[in-house]
Amino acid sequence: AGLLLIVSPSHPTEGSPVNLTCKMPSLQSSDAQFQFCFFRDDQALGPGWSSSPKLQIANMWKEDSGSYWCEAQTMASKVLRSWRSQINVHRVPVADVSLETQPPGGQVMEGDRLVLICSVAMGTGDITFLWYKGAIGLNLQTKTQRSLTAEYEIPTARESDAEQYYCVAENGYGPRPSGLVSITVRIPVSRPILMVRAPRAQAVVGDVLKLHCEALRGSHPILYWFYHEDVILGSSSAPSGGGASFNLSLTAEHSGNYSCEANNGLGAQRSEEVTLNFTVPTGARSNHLTS
């Protein structure tokens, strides 16, 4: 009777251990008189010849599938060989692919680091992760690694990074996409520009002046405050672009310095001051406004 190779478990899953035992036929005496060696496809495994009839392979991978056997050598150099056992390592297909962001929620400040973390709930072996930008995906990066998560990093987030993203994971059983994730890049307001619009070149008392304040950059909504000599005249919100306006009905007291402030919750910026002067002419001539 020859040797018997016992494989446990007989149908291993990738990443799990396998125990090989070289069993002596019952008519042989003590195992201690023998040296054992385990083989796969003509390659000796582990330590080669050893007095132990057992060998544990800590992590089996798909490429470890093959024909296994063991040999035992007596003191008299007589070699016994087991029958070959075919071991097929089972790969678990990727499932439940998800995309998460760091910072969480997909909101990142302009200039900050953004990480897109692609994860699979299950899946073994080499997993290829791909990241895509836009509903019609532009492939950003591809990584192949033996782990359930992988990261794509945008070191410095820019306005152009605000888009939909998704990732795809694949380990030989077909690609599996994650759901979509939307990235919002939050931009602090730039210094606003205050413009004064009068109905005529020489505005007079009673005319309505339009103060228009606009920050050319910054995430919306933006709240604009209007000031006369640092006293708040009023405020106006701009849910989308174009800035905000404030109407002022002119009186003689309206000479002085005007400014505006833009605030979108990510910081406030004050405009340069605009000086508006009235000349108070003699007689029946009206007050004129110059800036």
Partner: antibody, heavy 119, light 112 residues
């Protein structure tokens, strides 16, 4: 199973507005874009635009800008399309459809909502 | 806008025959990422459209292998090798490469 259930038929007067709903079930609503398509009686299909329910961000066909407003309510997994200043040209069947990214196709469609604009 | 022109407008066939529908785009619909987002949908009376083919030649799951798509650039074809009664309806090609996305005018497959 995945389903897109649209609101019932609408008969409205010219100049009025209408809101059509598309309730999604059987999947994570925020994971896919919802698109809207118009079909005039006896005619072909026209793509209106899409909305991403995750952030409510819409993208429109220029032709339908100003006419159409797309919104989504995550809490009820429902997408909406509002049509304003209605004319007889807006009389049509309107479909919502889910589009799968990466594979890139409309895999599930609503049953359609018939809008009739008539005085 | 990309104009999608389908021919013929109407296609009378006998059951068991082969049917061929052409779809031409007014410009190349190869996306900048290298993919061609050309799809075919079938709409039966009173129903919503159903997907048959995506990315020119990929059959959607559950679609019989009697349906096949081919083509590149601006010229695309849908072939039905042996027409069955269940195949009757209006076929639309669709391009999702350039916004605004556009459908063809439709081809009505009917019994001769």
């Amino acid at each position: 199973q995945v389903q897109l259930q649209q609101s019932g038929p609408e008969l409205v007067k010219p100049g009025a507005s209408v809101r059509i709903s598309c309730k999604a079930s059987g999947y994570t609503f925020t994971s896919y874009n919802i698109h809207w398509v118009k079909q005039r009686p006896g005619q072909g299909l026209e793509w209106i635009g899409w909305i991403y329910p995750g952030d409510g961000n819409p993208k429109y066909n220029e032709k339908f800008k100003g006419k159409t407003t797309l919104t989504a309510d995550k809490s009820s997994s429902t997408a909406y399309m509002q049509l304003s200043s209605l004319t007889s040209e807006d009389s049509a069947v309107y479909f919502c459809a889910r589009r799968i990214h990466y594979y890139d196709y409309f895999d599930y469609w609503g049953q359609g909502t018939t809008l009739t604009v008539s005085s | 806008d990309v104009l999608m022109t389908q021919t013929p407008l109407s296609l009378p066939v006998s059951l068991g025959d082969q049917a061929s529908i052409s779809c031409r785009s007014s410009q190349s619909i190869v996306h900048s990422n290298g993919n061609t987002y050309l799809e075919w949908y079938l709409q039966k009376p009173g129903q919503s459209p159903k997907l048959l083919i995506y990315k020119v030649s990929n059959r959607f799951s559950g679609v019989p292998d009697r349906f096949s798509g081919s083509g590149s650039g601006t010229d695309f074809t849908l072939k039905i090798s042996r027409v069955e009664a269940d195949d009757l309806g209006v076929y639309y090609c669709f391009q999702g490469s350039h916004v605004p996305w556009t459908f063809g005018g439709g081809t009505k497959l009917e019994i001769k």
